[in-house]
C-alpha cells in the first residue's frame, strides 16, 4: 500500500509568491512559492495519486506583513482552502500569546492541529481542551494513518506561550501516544513536528512505532540528485535513520518559506512496516502556474495590507540616523533602536535566577538601509521601516562562545574606514576599539550585560562561556564575512520578522528617542 506525503514547514507568512531568496517578489516571471502555486501542484498530485496527505510541520506564523496584519487568520483561511490534512504546532504559533493561537487558528482550522508534548494546566486547560490534539487518526483510502505531533521544548525561550503551557521532552511525550495508537490497531504512524532536524533524527531512532518523521524548525533542505535551486542539501531525501529496534525510518523536511513542496512516497506492508521510501522536494517555480481562484483570493486579502503600510505605528522625536556614513563607522541611534527592539522582543522571564535569558544584540551596520526623518510630524510607518530593513530577514537567537564573539568584533573593524557593512551595532554590549592596532587585535575592551543577575550590569566577556545573542539571520548564516558565527554557533533558532520586531517595539513605546550613548568607543 502506497502513501504520498506532501509536506511544508516554516512557511512563515509567505502566502504570496516570493523571489528565489524568499524575499518580496520583484520579477514575477522568476518568482516562486506562494499558496496559489502550491495549490496547483497539490491538486495535480491529488488527481494523479490515490492516497495523499498534505501536512505542515509548523511555523506558518510570522515572517511578513501578512502575519502582522491578519495575525493568523490568513493561515487558517488559506490552509483550509488548500485542504491541509494536519499541522503540527511550531514555536512561532505562540508569538501572539496563547490567545493569538486559539482565536485565529485553533478555532478556525478545519484540520487537526497537533502536539503531543504541550500540556495545558490551570485555567487554560479547559479553555484549550480539544482545540489541539496529541495525535489524530486519519482515514486514507481503505487504511488509517496516525499522525502524532511535537513542538520544540525551547518554545518558552523563543516565543510567548505563557505560564499555563508545559513543553515536555519530545521523545518522552511521544512514546505513550504512539503506544496508544498501536493499541488502537493503527500501524502506520507519522511523527509530524517542529523541533529541528537533530531532534527529528532522534525521534526516528528512539520512538518505537514511528514509521516516518516529517519535521521543521531547522529549515533543513534534503535532496537526492542535483538540487534545482540555490539551497545546498544537508543530506539525501529522505534521510534514513536506523531505529534502535532495527527499522529504517525516513526523515524529511522541506527547507522553508513555501519554496518547495516536500514529496515522499512510502510503501507500507500489511503490518505497517515501511518497505520503501523515495521522493524529493518539488521546487515551486514559475513553471507551475498559480491557481486562479486562490490567486484572486490572495489579491482580495492583499488590499488591507497596502492600507496598513501607511498607517502610523508610533512617533519619533529624534532623527533616526540610519545613514551608512554613521552606521558603518560608529554607534548610530538607529542601530541602538533596532537592537533595543530585538532584546525587548526576546524578554522571557522563565527563571527566577535570570532577569532575562538573553541580553545581547549584534547587528551589521550594512543591514541598516535608511534613516527616518523626525520632521514629518515624527510619524513612523511600516513603509518607513521597510526602507530601513528591506531584506525581509529575521532576528534570530543563537548561542555562541565568548571566543566567537571576540572574533566577530575583531571582524567588525578588520578593514575599518572603507564603509563596509560588517561594522557591528550593538545592544547589551560595551566595546572599545583601538584602531591604531593591527587588524585582528583591535578589540581592547568587551563587556557584556549579565543575565543571571537581578540588577543588570556589564562584566568582561569570558572566552569559554556560552552566551545567548540576538542577531539578524544574515549574520547567523555567515553573511558579511562573519563565517566564525556560522561555523562556531552552538545553537540557532530562527526568530521574528525584522520589521515586525521594530514596529511592535515602536507601537509599544508610542514615542521613541534613541540616543548615541557610548556603546561603541
Amino acid at each position: 500500500w502506497e502513501l504520498t506525503i506532501l509536506h511544508t514547514n516554516d512557511v512563515h507568512s509567505r502566502l504570496e509568491q516570493t523571489s528565489e531568496d524568499s524575499s518580496k517578489c520583484v520579477n514575477a516571471s522568476r518568482c516562486m512559492g506562494g499558496v496559489a502555486r502550491l495549490f496547483t501542484k497539490v491538486q495535480q498530485i491529488r488527481r494523479a495519486e490515490p492516497n495523499v496527505l498534505l501536512l505542515d510541520a509548523g511555523d506558518q506564523y510570522q515572517g511578513t506583513i501578512w502575519f502582522t496584519v491578519y495575525k493568523g487568520a490568513e493561515v487558517a483561511h488559506f490552509m483550509n482552502a488548500l485542504r491541509y490534512d494536519a499541522m503540527a504546532l511550531g514555536n512561532h504559533e505562540f508569538d501572539n500569546g496563547v490567545e493569538g493561537l486559539i482565536e485565529p487558528l485553533l478555532k478556525e482550522a478545519k484540520f487537526p492541529i497537533l502536539s503531543a508534548n504541550i500540556k495545558a494546566k490551570g485555567p487554560l486547560a479547559s479553555q484549550i481542551s480539544g482545540l489541539y490534539l496529541p495525535y489524530k487518526v486519519l482515514p486514507v483510502g481503505d487504511e488509517v494513518v496516525g499522525i502524532v505531533g511535537y513542538t520544540s521544548k525551547e518554545t518558552p525561550f523563543l516565543s510567548n506561550p505563557g505560564t499555563n503551557l508545559v513543553f515536555e521532552d519530545e521523545i518522552t511525550a511521544l512514546q505513550p501516544e504512539v503506544d496508544k495508537l498501536k493499541t488502537l490497531n493503527v500501524n502506520k504512524i507519522i511523527a509530524l513536528g517542529h523541533s529541528g532536524f537533530e531532534m527529528d533524527k532522534l525521534i526516528a531512532q528512539k520512538v518505537r512505532g514511528v514509521d516516518v518523521v516529517v519535521g521543521g524548525h531547522s529549515n533543513t533542505f534534503l535532496y537526492t540528485g542535483n538540487p534545482p535551486s540555490k539551497e545546498v542539501p544537508a543530506g539525501k531525501y529522505p534521510f534514513i535513520v536506523t531505529s534502535d529496534d532495527g527499522r529504517k525510518v525516513p526523515v524529511v523536511q522541506a527547507y522553508a518559506f513555501g519554496k518547495y513542496l516536500g514529496y515522499l512516497k512510502i510503501e507500507f506492508d500489511e503490518r505497517g512496516n515501511v518497505i520503501s521510501s523515495h521522493g524529493n522536494p518539488i521546487l515551486l517555480n514559475s513553471s507551475i502556474p498559480e491557481d486562479p481562484s486562490i490567486k484572486a483570493d490572495i489579491n482580495k486579502w492583499r488590499i488591507k495590507l497596502d492600507n496598513y503600510s501607511t498607517q502610523e505605528l508610533g512617533k519619533t522625536i529624534v532623527y533616526l540616523d540610519g545613514s551608512s556614513q554613521s552606521c558603518r563607522f560608529r554607534e548610530c541611534n538607529m542601530g541602538n533602536l533596532i537592537c533595543d527592539a530585538m532584546i525587548n522582543n526576546n524578554l522571557r522571564h522563565t527563571d527566577e535566577m535570570f532577569w532575562n535569558h538573553v541580553s545581547m544584540c549584534i547587528l551589521n551596520g550594512g543591514g541598516i538601509r535608511s534613516p527616518i526623518d523626525e520632521r514629518n510630524n515624527g510619524t513612523i510607518t511600516w513603509e518607513n521601516l521597510a526602507a530601513v530593513l528591506p531584506f525581509g530577514g529575521t532576528f534570530d537567537l543563537v548561542q555562541l562562545k565568548g571566543s566567537t564573539l571576540k572574533k566577530a568584533f575583531e571582524h567588525s573593524v578588520h578593514r575599518y574606514g572603507q564603509s563596509t557593512g560588517e561594522f557591528l551595532q550593538v545592544g547589551g554590549i560595551h566595546v572599545v576599539y583601538d584602531l591604531s592596532r593591527k587588524p585582528g587585535d583591535r578589540v581592547v575592551k568587551l563587556d557584556v550585560l549579565c543575565t543571571k543577575c537581578r540588577v543588570p550590569s556589564y562584566d568582561p566577556l569570558k572566552m569559554d562561556e556560552v552566551y545567548k545573542v540576538i542577531l539578524p539571520n544574515f549574520l547567523a548564516n555567515g553573511g558579511d564575512g562573519f563565517q566564525m558565527i556560522k561555523d562556531e554557533l552552538l545553537r540557532h533558532d530562527s526568530g521574528d520578522q525584522d520589521i515586525n520586531v521594530v514596529s511592535t517595539y515602536i507601537s509599544k513605546m508610542k514615542v521613541i528617542y534613541p540616543a548615541v550613548e557610548g556603546r561603541i568607543k
Epitope: D142, E143, E270, R271, I275
Partner: antibody, heavy 113, light 106 residues
C-alpha cells in the same frame, strides 16, 4: 492483529480440482495483495500466484493453465483453485501477505486415490 | 524470472557461533528482499524485510545487508532457538525463493 488462515480439503483425488480459501483479518484486501505458496514434503518453497489489491493476478508460468485466483473483498477472502491435481501436487499450501510480513499456518493437501 | 541462489544449503554450528548466509539474485532486486525462518510444525516467520530492517520482536542478533544482487543474513551469536531453515525471498518481481539453508547443531 494481522492474521491469515488457509482452509480447504486435506485430501483430494487425482484429476480433481483443489479449492483453497485464505481468510484475512487485520488488513483490507482493497489495500494489499495475497500470495499463494506451496512446499512439498521435505522440498523447497514454490510460489504459485498472487492477486493484487486492484484485482489483477499473476501466476507461476509452470502452473498458469491450472490456477485461478479470485477474491471477495467484503468477506476478506481469497480463493485459489488448482485443476487436474496429481500426487506430485501433495504439499503444504500457504497464503501470505503481499510483502511476506504475515503467513498462514499452512494446510497440508494430500493427492491420493 | 529472477533466480535466487542461496548458500550454503546447510551448515552445522554451535551455540554462540556467528553464522552468515548469502543469497545472489540473477538481476538487481533493489533491496526488495526478505529473510524467512521456518521451523517444523510452525508458521513461516519473516525476520528481515527490505534487506536490512528487523521485524517486530526479532532479536537484534539477526541482521541483514546487501544491495543489487548480493544479500547476506547474519546471526551474530547463534542461540538454541535459532536452529531452523532460513530462506531468502525476493519480491522485486514475482516471488522467488532461495533454496534454503538448514542450520543444524554441530
Amino acid at each position: 492483529e494481522v492474521t491469515l488462515k488457509e482452509s480447504g480439503p486435506v485430501l483430494v483425488k487425482p484429476t480433481e480440482t483443489l479449492t483453497l480459501t485464505c481468510t484475512v483479518s487485520g488488513f483490507s484486501l482493497s489495500s494489499y495483495g495475497i500470495q499463494w505458496i506451496r512446499q512439498p514434503p521435505g522440498k523447497l518453497l514454490e510460489w504459485l500466484a498472487v492477486i493484487w489489491s486492484g484485482g489483477s493476478a499473476d501466476y507461476n508460468a509452470a502452473f498458469i493453465s491450472r490456477l485461478t485466483i479470485s477474491k471477495d473483498t467484503s468477506k476478506s477472502q481469497v480463493v485459489l483453485t488448482m485443476t487436474n491435481m496429481d500426487p506430485v501436487d501433495t504439499a503444504t499450501y500457504y497464503c501470505a501477505g503481499q510483502y511476506g510480513s504475515v503467513w498462514g499456518q499452512g494446510t497440508l493437501v494430500t493427492v491420493s486415490s | 524470472d529472477i533466480q535466487m541462489t542461496q548458500s550454503p544449503s546447510s551448515l552445522s554450528a554451535s551455540v554462540g557461533d556467528r553464522v552468515t548466509i548469502t543469497c545472489r539474485a540473477s538481476q538487481d532486486i533493489g533491496d526488495r528482499l526478505n529473510w524467512l525462518q521456518q521451523k517444523p510444525g510452525k508458521a513461516i516467520k519473516r525476520l528481515i524485510y527490505a534487506t536490512s530492517s528487523l521485524d517486530s520482536g526479532v532479536p537484534k542478533r539477526f541482521s541483514g545487508s546487501g544491495s543489487g544482487t548480493e544479500y547476506t543474513l547474519t546471526i551474530s551469536s547463534l542461540q538454541p532457538e535459532d536452529f531452523a531453515t532460513y530462506y531468502c525471498l525476493q519480491y522485486a518481481g514475482s516471488w522467488t525463493f532461495g533454496g534454503g539453508t538448514k542450520v543444524e547443531i554441530k
